[in-house]
């Protein structure tokens, strides 16, 4: 690495992956193992994040970027940059202080994380429930029968029940 010659800040020419080493006349030195600098002109390299325990490595640390962690199976990330791992529950459950609990009637959770949410109230939109809700799934709303046709009341009374082939009376 060559000595920087900047008249203003000699460290500004140090690229990402290096640091400006004050102990060596501000020469740009490479980041030591298990450290990185993601921008140029840095006077120190940052220590790489280590993904241990319930965390696992999603992306290895390099000289220019930090390691990225996610969670081991059965857990999911919370917080910026996956700062915490929280236990998964099954669909149809939510995590409480006492562990995973089934959603109460009238609520659902279609994911392994988060809380149980109330079923959609179709009638607020003037619709009907097409498919009933479950612990795992919201109701499906759709047109009420009266939105699809006027129904039997709209036509002349139907012919009496008969076998095909017989003319209506």
């Amino acid at each position: 690495f060559e000595r920087t010659r900047s008249l203003q800040d000699p460290c500004s020419n140090c690229p990402a992956g290096t640091f400006c080493d004050n102990n060596r006349n501000q020469i740009c030195s490479p980041c030591p193992p298990n450290s990185f600098s993601s921008a140029g002109g840095q006077r120190t390299c940052d220590i790489c994040r280590q993904c241990k325990g319930v965390f696992r490595t999603r992306k290895e640390c390099s000289s220019t970027s930090n390691a990225e962690c996610d969670c081991t199976p059965g857990f999911h990330c919370l917080g910026a940059g996956c700062s915490m791992c929280e236990q998964d529950c099954k669909q149809g459950q939510e995590l409480t202080k006492k562990g995973c609990k089934d959603c109460c009637f009238g609520t659902f959770n279609d994911q392994k994380r988060g809380i149980c949410r109330p079923w959609t109230n179709c009638s607020l939109d003037g619709k009907s429930v097409l498919v009933n809700g479950t612990k795992e799934r919201d109701v499906v709303c759709g047109p009420s029968p009266a939105d699809l046709s006027p129904g039997a009341s709209s036509v002349t009374p139907p012919a009496p029940a008969r076998e095909p082939g017989h003319s209506p009376q």
């Epitope: 009907s128 097409l130 498919v131 009933n132 759709g142 047109p143 029968p145 009266a146 939105d147 699809l148 046709s149 006027p150 129904g151 039997a152 709209s154 036509v155 009374p157 139907p158 012919a159 029940a161």
Partner: antibody
Framework: QVQLKESGPGLVAPSQSLSITCTVS????????LSWIRQPPGKGLEWLGV???????NYNSAFMSRLSISKDSSKSQVFLKMNSLQTDDTAIYYC?????WGQGTTLTVSS | DVVMTQTPLSLPVSLGDQASISCRSS???????????LHWYLQKPGQSPKLLIY???NRFSGVPDRFSGSGSGTDFTLKISRVEAEDLGVYFC?????????FGGGTKLEIK
């Protein structure tokens, strides 16, 4: 998941009768009307008749003399019966609630 | 019987274009209960028709908001604001106000 499924014979000889069953799941035949519609090869859609939620029926007058629609709500099934079939009855037959349709059953009338 | 007339028969479009399909009925589709039972379907090759719009202007569950319906009485329109590849197929209008229920002859939406 709302589903309608037609089951029919596939091939019928001229002058013979047709029976098709429509089996529905995840909704009630006591709430929704169910119609039968057919589509001849490469052509448009033709309404045959309806069985209303309450059990009454109405038929397209063009088929009135040879068509019957009935249902067994407890089994979630609707039945279409048509007799005196001719080659021009060859079509895909659909059951539908207007908002949901079955995948259709293909009928060929041929000797 | 109520005759439903759709125009055009074929509608060549470029992806991203707006498309408009007209449907006219031979008599008013306003029922004595005040509702107008005019519906729009899309049928793709080898599939059954799928409901897009019911009662003139109501989008069915899961139908993208690029589809819209309008009209009244005897004159109705289906508009697709930005045509996507998955929109190609045959569009039918249908009325269930009067027995027998009837369908338009279909409009084939295809790539220009």
């Amino acid at each position: 998941q709302v589903q309608l499924k037609e089951s029919g014979p596939g091939l019928v000889a001229p002058s013979q009768s047709l029976s098709i069953t429509c089996t529905v799941s995840d909704f009630s035949l006591t709430s929704y009307d169910l119609s039968w519609i057919r589509q001849p090869p490469g052509k448009g859609l033709e309404w045959l008749g309806v069985i209303w939620a309450g059990g009454g029926t109405n038929y397209n007058s063009a088929f009135m003399s040879r068509l019957s629609i009935s249902k067994d709500s407890s089994k979630s099934q609707v039945f279409l019966k048509m007799n005196s079939l001719q080659t021009d009855d060859t079509a895909i037959y659909y059951c539908t609630t207007v908002h949901y349709w079955g995948q259709g059953t293909t009928l060929t009338v041929s000797s | 019987d109520v005759v439903m007339t759709q125009t055009p028969l074929s509608l060549p479009v470029s992806l991203g274009d707006q498309a408009s399909i007209s449907c006219r009925s031979s008599q008013s589709l306003v029922h004595s209960n005040g509702n107008t039972y005019l519906h729009w379907y899309l049928q793709k090759p080898g599939q059954s028709p799928k409901l897009l719009i019911y009662k003139v202007s109501n989008r069915f569950s899961g139908v993208p908001d690029r589809f819209s319906g309008s009209g009244s009485g005897t004159d109705f329109t289906l508009k697709i604001s930005r045509v996507e590849a998955e929109d190609l197929g045959v569009y039918f209008c249908s009325q269930s106000t009067h027995v027998p229920w009837t369908f338009g002859g279909g409009t084939k939406l295809e790539i220009k």
